[in-house]
């Protein structure tokens, strides 16, 4: 807490300007009127205040707005946002995308902080869903944002917002998240033609079921190995050698380099060695000729 001291004669601030950088903490506290500060917040970011001086300005705003700052002040916080705590931000009602953008701009390049996470949470909850404009903004500042959401939170993303998602936005998503996003992407891109559809859906395929992979294998898509390696193991296992060959096209040769890794390893174990040999890649570990394959999952389903 800064002690309450009288403002020295002639030092009362008439406006927020650069002369204030020469004020000591106690002079800022005594000589700057909180209401003046609130109306001239847009000037603060142009003035090279130290973090210590910003603490004093924050204290003045906190006293003026104990229930939380109005959006007119929030939009112009600038570097003062770096001094806010998640508790401060929980008191705010941010409705304008412009305000959100202004605050994310201050944090550009920073790691995702609890302050930013709280701000985004408040904003998205206020909107009711993660609409396309918001998602566009968030992923522009934080490419990993989408993958930081839980499957439950992702379920509120409307399919129309999927158009804003770039491949790099999904880099850190796990299979549970892709399980939620894939059906939305399929719906969003359903009216596109084959090759265009594949380009758009490719980064979401970690959530695709077997039947969709089978369908893609009939469309000459030439899936690359990096995408194939991210597919769900349980979705890959039922694919035949012929289907995988069609799915990968010229990239099928890459299976050899990945034969020890999932899902390739597990898929090989499910194929007849005869069928694997037709690829001419020297893949080993398939079911030897003459062995009977029992599908235990089907047996369990019947019982």
């Amino acid at each position: 807490e800064v002690e309450k001291t009288a403002c020295p004669s002639g030092k009362k601030a008439r406006e927020i300007d650069e002369s204030l950088i020469f004020y000591k903490k106690w002079e800022l506290e005594a000589c700057v009127d909180a209401a003046l500060l609130a109306t001239q917040m847009d000037r603060v970011n142009a003035i090279p205040f130290t973090y210590e001086q910003l603490d004093v300005l924050k204290h003045k705003l906190d006293e003026l707005y104990p229930q939380g700052y109005p959006e007119s002040v929030i939009q112009h916080l600038g570097y003062l946002f770096l001094k806010m705590s998640p508790e401060d931000i929980r008191k705010w009602n941010v409705t304008s995308l412009e305000t959100l953008k202004a605050l994310l701009e201050v944090n550009k390049g920073h790691e995702m902080s609890p302050q930013v996470a709280t701000l985004i949470d408040r904003f998205v909850k206020g909107r009711g869903q993660l609409d396309k404009d918001t998602l566009d903004t968030l992923t522009a500042f934080y490419p990993g944002y989408l993958c930081s959401l839980s499957p439950e939170e992702l379920s509120s993303v409307p399919p129309s917002s999927i158009w804003a998602v770039r491949p790099q936005d999904l880099d850190t998503c796990d299979p549970r998240q892709l399980d939620v996003l894939y059906p939305k992407a399929r719906l969003a891109f359903q009216n596109m033609n084959g090759s265009e559809y594949f380009v758009k859906i490719q980064s979401f395929l970690g959530g695709a079921p077997t039947e969709d992979l089978k369908a893609l294998s009939q469309q000459n898509v030439s899936m690359d190995l990096a995408t194939f390696m991210k597919l769900r193991t349980d979705a890959v296992l039922p694919l035949t050698v012929a289907e995988v060959q069609k799915l990968l096209g010229p990239h099928v040769e890459g299976l050899k380099a990945e034969e020890r890794h999932r899902p390739v390893r597990d898929w090989i174990l499910r194929q007849r060695q005869d069928d694997l040999d037709t690829l001419g890649l020297g893949l080993q570990g398939g079911i030897p000729n003459g062995y009977l394959v029992l599908d235990l999952s089907m047996q369990e389903a019947l019982s």
């Epitope: 650069e18 950088i21 142009a46 003035i47 090279p48 205040f49 130290t50 973090y51 210590e52 910003l54 570097y79 770096l82 550009k108 390049g109 920073h110 790691e111 902080s113 609890p114 302050q115």
Partner: antibody
Framework: QVQLVESGGGLVKPGGSLRLSCAAS????????MSWIRQAPGKCLEWISY????????YYVDSVKGRFTISRDNAKNSLYLQMNSLRAEDTAVYYC??????????WGQGTLVTVSS | DIQMTQSPSSVSASVGDRVTITCRAS??????LAWYQQKPGKAPKLLIS???RLQSGVPSRFSGSGSGTDFTLTISSLQPEDFAIYYC?????????FGCGTKVEIK
């Protein structure tokens, strides 16, 4: 008086790791943001990272993002820089500095990191 | 990133001379500029913050001016202990960036 003393530098092979420390005294460490700045031999100064007093706000320059991790222990008045996947271009004198927002008001003497095979 | 360009890269001067060093920012940084002095084998030392605010304990022969993109550090009467490298640094936006220095040498 304010004092910052870096340690932990040395010779390391490319791909190796080092952990730098900065011991602070003469001020209330937990009240201040702290930064790491480096200077390659005969080159410009390069600010590489900072951390807020509470550790909630962190920034890395692109050249070290994903390889370096800044942290602090306010109870021990110490700032750290964990450096992984080191490259020849990371060879520099590393300074810790007290960061007051508009400038760095106090600097340590620096610790030399040499990355070479 | 904001680029900081210092000129000249070196200057030869005599004791008692007036020396002026300039720093130009690639975009408007208002007055978010600091100047530092570095002597061989030593850490940089803060001279001026906020473009013109003299740091406590720094001799008054040092002064800073400028705003926007063009800034100046002036040493009104060079002293023997002033031979060093001088750096400017912007703090208007992240990442903070430094100029590459101006070396003040003995003529």
């Amino acid at each position: 008086q304010v004092q910052l003393v870096e340690s932990g530098g040395g010779l390391v092979k490319p791909g190796g790791s080092l952990r730098l420390s900065c011991a602070a005294s003469g001020f209330t460490f937990s009240d201040y943001y702290m930064s790491w700045i480096r200077q390659a031999p005969g080159k410009c100064l390069e600010w590489i990272s900072y951390i807020s007093s509470s550790e909630s706000i962190i920034y890395y320059v692109d050249s070290v993002k994903g390889r370096f991790t800044i942290s602090r222990d306010n109870a021990k008045n110490s700032l750290y820089l964990q450096m992984n996947s080191l490259r020849a271009e990371d060879t520099a004198v590393y300074y810790c500095a007290r960061d007051v927002g508009s400038h760095f008001d106090y600097w340590g003497q620096g610790t030399l990191v040499t990355v070479s095979s | 990133d904001i680029q900081m360009t210092q000129s000249p890269s070196s200057v030869s001067a005599s004791v008692g001379d007036r020396v002026t060093i300039t720093c130009r920012a690639s975009q408007d940084i208002s007055r978010w500029l600091a100047w530092y002095q570095q002597k061989p084998g030593k850490a940089p030392k803060l001279l001026i913050s906020a473009a013109s605010r003299l740091q406590s304990g720094v001799p008054s022969r040092f002064s800073g001016s400028g705003s926007g993109t063009d800034f100046t550090l002036t040493i009104s009467s060079l002293q023997p202990e002033d031979f060093a490298i001088y750096y400017c640094q912007q703090a208007k936006s992240f990442p903070r960036t430094f100029g590459c220095g101006t070396k003040v040498e003995i003529k």
